[in-house]
Each structure stands twice: as C-alpha cells, then as structure tokens.
C-alpha cells in the first residue's frame, strides 16, 4: 500500500504520500481555530505508471494506453484514497468546542 | 456536475471530463477483443482551483492551501468521479463470449 | 468587492418554513464564518446563529428553540437560512453577515441587502 | 446571556457637534486582552456597516471622525463633526459570550 509507512520510509519516485504540514492561520488563513495550530495533512504526489496501484479498471486501460502513447495528456493521477479525521477545538465566546472533522489527514494514495 | 453533459458543450479549462476514443488494438494491444474495435473512454483534465468541484474536506483544505501557497506542489487533482461498465464480445476458440467490463467509460470528473 | 446578495422577499402562512439564500462573491467563502440575524419591524438586531461553510459547523441562539436550521453550498458559495414552524412574531428582515475573521462568534464586516419575510394567514 | 443596554435611546446633534452614545454590559466582555466590543451604523433603508471593531479600532473605509473607547462593561462611541449623512440608528455588540448579542440601538 502507497501509506505513510512505507511512503515515508522511502524515496519512492512514483505515486506515494508525502509530507505535508498545514499552518491553520498561516496556509488556510483560519485564525479561530485554538488546537492545534496546524497539522500533519499530508498529500499525494509522484506518477502513475502502468500497473502502479491502480484504482479502477479504468485507470489500468488509461495507464496502458499512456504506455502506447507516452506524449497523450490522459493519464491516471495520484489522489488520496485513505484519509483520516482530525479532532480542533475552538472557542464560541468563552465557551470551548472541540469538533472531529472527516477527511482531513492523507494516510495513503492510488492512481486513479 | 463536472459530467459529458456539461464539459463536451463547453469550454471549460479547468477539470472537467474529455473526449478521448481507445482504440483496443492500437492504443492497448488487445488483439483478441472483437467487437467493439474500441470506444469512447473519456479522461479527466484540467486544473482544480478552489471551490472546483471538490470531492472531500481535505480537498477543500488542500486548494485553499494552494491558493495561499501558488508554487506549492500539493493541489487537488482532476480524477473520474462517476465510471460506466461496457459490454465486449471476445471468442473463446469458436465460441463468442459477451462480458460486462466495469468502470471503463468516463462520465464525469471531480477534484481529489 | 466582496458582496453578500439574498433572495426575494418571501410571504408565507404559519406553520410553513421559510429558507432564505446568500449568495456570496469577491471572498474565498470557506474562509469565513456566516451569520445569520433578524430585524423585526421597528426593532433592533437578534443573531440566530452562524455556519462554517468548508465543513458545515454550526452554533446556534437557543432562542431560536431548534427551529432555525443553517446549511452552506460551497460548490456555489451560498449560504442558507432554514426557518421553521413560523408565526407572526417570526415577520423580520433576515440579514446574512460575514463574521470578521478573527474568532468563531465575531463583529460582522459584510452584510446581505435583507430578506423581509412576511407570516400571514 | 449578555444584556447590553444603550443610552440615550435617540439623540439630535447639530451639525458639526460631538455626539456620544453609550453602551453598558451587563458583565465585563474582556477576555484575553481584548474588549470583544464593536459598533454599527444602520442608515434608514439600509443593511448595518461594521464602524469600530474590539472597542476602539477604526474598520477600515470608516470615517476617523468615528472613535470608540471603554473596557470591561463600559463603552463609548464618539462621532466628532456630526454630518447629516451620520443620521441613523447606532448599535453596539458584543461576542464575548454565546449567544451573540446586540444593543437595542440608539436612532
């Protein structure tokens, strides 16, 4: 699996997750957000030869068929396919509120 | 939606579904298919700015963080969203053999 | 320029809802709280509540007893004001207001043009 | 919750006077250093305009003529050289406790 584990422990050219740490005021613009001040996001990055985690069957007939045409604009992408919550907290007025949002933390990626 | 409704009669730049036609002798060196000689496949391009059709939080967080950050190389990417099957007729020695093959047609994009 | 634009006023019977629409431009939308808050003919200003568009985040004045409901279309940057079970106290302009940026509950920098709702049988 | 309470409910001031509007708390709304304290103007017909952000900040575009000042409960907004354009109903609110509230206005 193209995880942080094995992504982060390599130097891997191809699609893997790379590192990637988000400033919530600095990056987003966010200043509300109390804990954290940024975090860990992660992000997808490297190309999609053919047969390299393949997403659908799709994605294998676009890989091949950039091997048989290697200058086509058609090709698969490395996106996120785990993806983890992150818990924040905020204030609302004086009061704290702490909120689990989804999707927030790349754990691993795929060609699709 | 980022579908063939809307991006074949457009022309829109930025991710969106694309005309592309696979030829399975030429462009994939599947000899043994027989009918059909190809078809149209489809692919996904374009650029994923913010608010573009965006598939998860993390997706949202990551243009954001493009857009205050222009040179950084995390951003979304455009990948196929909603995925067609096609029938295909192949010969098992005389024997003609119909088969559905999932996730091959391209209907629309999305930024991930 | 970052303009805040409602829809039309609305003329509806008790018991009915109302959802009110703020369509937002010149701003990143998923950047910015959004506040929704009413005006009762001759009367001052009551905030309802407000939403965090980029995950739908929403804290609410508990006056308004669970009637108000707010929701956020970021693929469109338009925010929603849901309002149900309505009586004639209900009758009020309802302003969208852009939260200032710093904290969650904050002073309001940009304003909608008002959408008068109208209860009557 | 927070009751805010201005004072004068409505004013007339010449033009070129000072006018002053105050607003009490019904407890202190500050917190961590600021005085989460902001005032509005609401011109007849119109949407209200942010004027003085956390007590005593000038909201950029606004006016100078405009200036606030106070802490804890206490709060003072200030329009020197009184215009006919400033006519309006004026409003103080606070956010340092939920839920959000408002002065009642002062015309």
């Known amino acids: 699996a193209l995880d942080t584990n094995y992504c982060f422990s390599s130097t891997e050219k191809n699609c893997c997750v790379r590192q990637l740490y988000i400033d919530f005021r600095k990056d987003l613009g966010w200043k509300w957000i109390h804990e954290p001040k940024g975090y860990h996001a992660n992000f997808c990055l490297g190309p999609c030869p053919y047969i390299w985690s393949l997403d659908t069957q799709y994605s294998k007939v676009l890989a091949l068929y950039n091997q048989h045409n290697p200058g086509a604009s058609a090709a698969p992408c490395c996106v996120p396919q785990a993806l983890e919550p992150l818990p924040i907290v905020y204030y609302v007025g004086r009061k704290p509120k702490v909120e689990q949002l989804s999707n927030m933390i790349v754990r691993s990626c795929k060609c699709s | 939606a980022l579908d063939t409704n809307y991006c074949f009669s457009s022309t829109e730049k930025n991710c969106c579904v694309r005309q592309l036609y696979i030829d399975f002798r030429k462009d994939l060196g599947w000899k043994w298919i027989h009918e059909p000689k190809g078809y149209h496949a489809n692919f996904c391009l374009g650029p994923c700015p913010y608010i573009w059709s965006l598939d998860t939080q993390y997706s949202k967080v990551l243009a954001l963080y493009n857009q205050h950050n222009p040179g950084a190389s995390a951003a979304p990417c455009c990948v196929p969203q909603a995925l067609e099957p096609l029938p295909i007729v192949y010969y098992v020695g005389r024997k003609p053999k119909v088969e559905q093959l999932s996730n091959m047609i391209v209907r629309s994009c999305k930024c991930s | 320029e970052v303009q805040l634009v409602q829809s039309g006023a609305e003329v509806k019977k008790p018991g009915a809802s109302v959802k009110v629409s703020c369509k937002t431009s010149g701003y990143t939308f998923i950047k910015y709280w959004m506040n929704w808050v009413r005006q009762a003919p001759g009367a001052g200003l009551d905030w309802m509540g407000q939403?965090?568009?980029?995950?739908?985040?929403?804290n609410y004045n508990e006056m308004f007893e669970g009637r108000v409901t707010l929701t956020a279309d970021t693929s469109t940057s338009t925010a929603y004001m849901e309002l149900s079970s309505l009586r004639a106290g209900d009758i009020a302009v309802y302003y969208c207001?852009?939260?200032?940026?710093?904290?969650?509950?904050?002073?309001?920098?940009?304003w909608g043009q008002g959408t008068l709702v109208t209860v009557s049988s | 919750d927070i009751v805010m309470t201005q004072t004068p409910p409505s004013l007339s001031v010449s033009p070129r006077e000072t006018a002053s509007i105050s607003c009490r708390a019904s407890e202190s709304v500050d917190s961590y250093g600021n005085s989460f304290m902001h005032w509005y103007l609401q011109k007849p017909g119109q949407s209200p305009q942010l004027l003085i952000y956390?007590?005593?900040n000038l909201e950029s575009g606004v006016s100078d003529r405009f200036s606030g000042s106070g802490s804890g409960t206490d709060f003072t907004l200030r329009i020197s050289r009184v215009e006919a354009n400033d006519t309006g109903v004026y409003y103080c609110q606070q956010n340092d406790e939920d839920p959000l509230s408002f002065g009642q206005g002062t015309k």
């Open positions: 939403i965090f568009p980029a995950w739908g985040s929403t």
């Open positions: 207001a852009r939260g200032y940026g710093n904290y969650a509950l904050d002073a309001m920098d940009y």
């Open positions: 956390l007590a005593s």
